[in-house]
């Protein structure tokens, strides 16, 4: 769920998601449209696709709570939960490390980006 994602992103990137990523660009945060603005925004667009796939599979992406361990900079998703819980953790782990990989190109000007400026084709999943 959202609490899992926030905690994981903070642990992996060292940034407070609510201040740094939700929202950011055209796809980080709720919703998303248009062409992603940069690599960080692409992380979020890919994550949206991951969530969309789980939604089609009947998973409650915002409610399902999963367990994971964070140790020595790595995330280990618990294999104890339901199928949805395990897949949700995998989606969140991927976006957390994607955001970390792209910290060097993070642009403060894209924080709280005005969504009506998000134009162009929204990438398919």
């Amino acid at each position: 769920g959202i609490l899992n994602l926030n905690k994981m992103v903070k642990q992996v990137t060292g940034k407070m998601p609510i201040l740094s990523y939700w929202p950011y660009g055209c796809h980080c945060g709720l919703g998303g449209r248009g062409q992603p603005k940069d690599a960080t925004d692409w992380c979020c667009q890919t994550h949206d696709c991951c969530y969309d796939h789980l939604k089609t599979q009947g998973c409650s992406i915002y409610k399902d709570y999963y367990r994971y361990n964070f140790s020595q900079g790595n995330i280990h998703c618990s294999d104890k939960g339901s199928w949805c819980e395990q897949q949700l953790c995998a989606c969140d782990k991927e976006v957390a490390f994607c955001l970390k990989r792209n910290l060097d190109t993070y642009q403060k000007r894209l924080r709280f980006y005005w969504r009506p400026h998000c134009r162009g084709q929204t990438p398919g999943c």
Epitope: Q57, G58, C59, S60, D64, D79, S82, W83, C84
Partner: antibody, heavy 120, light 106 residues
Framework: QVTLKESGPGILQSSQTLSLTCSFS??????????VSWIRQPSGKGLEWLAH???????RYNPSLKSRLTISKDTSRNQVFLKITSVDTADSATYYC????????????WGQGTTLTVSS | QIVLTQSPAIMSASPGEKVTISCSAS?????MYWYQQKPGSSPKRWIY???KLASGVPARFSGSGSGTSYSLTISSMEAEDAATYYC?????????FGSGTKLEIK
Amino acid sequence: QVTLKESGPGILQSSQTLSLTCSFSGFSLSTSGMGVSWIRQPSGKGLEWLAHIYWDDDKRYNPSLKSRLTISKDTSRNQVFLKITSVDTADSATYYCARRESKYFYFDYWGQGTTLTVSS
Amino acid sequence: QIVLTQSPAIMSASPGEKVTISCSASSSVSYMYWYQQKPGSSPKRWIYDTSKLASGVPARFSGSGSGTSYSLTISSMEAEDAATYYCQQYHSYPPTFGSGTKLEIK
């Protein structure tokens, strides 16, 4: 060869506490990924999952019964226990323990079951 | 929680007849699992990951489905197949079972 065997009191009065034991062999609950569930089946009816305990002592309960259930284990004796408080006639059923490995989403080995009758 | 509805509740089939048992989920699931239970015995894992047969299960059994609709099929009914069959999901917590389909031999 994996085997599980349940034992219990057979008969209880309403409001008493049910204590069940599952004794197993052929696997160890100290092995990562291993777990044991309790599942019950009222006579002539379907199956209801109750609780699960993992190798690392993590536990899961059926939300509809959570307040009445306690699952525990004795790894060295290869046993898993289930307690159900304040039993009622609706708890009359055959109780099974079953093994589930975390990487699978089904129960691969089941015990023979132990029958509980609750009298009012 | 996900509710699994099996149909029919009871059915009878003649030897050699094709049998299909259905399991409908209240919301989409990724995989379905099936168990066979005979009177006085515990359930046995029968079909896993929707379509894979457990060890020792005859090849006349098959499983299929996706989303909310799954089924177990026996291509040619035999007397030893008379039993109750249960579907089960652990797509989302908690794991749940269907109400069962009792299959009798004519």
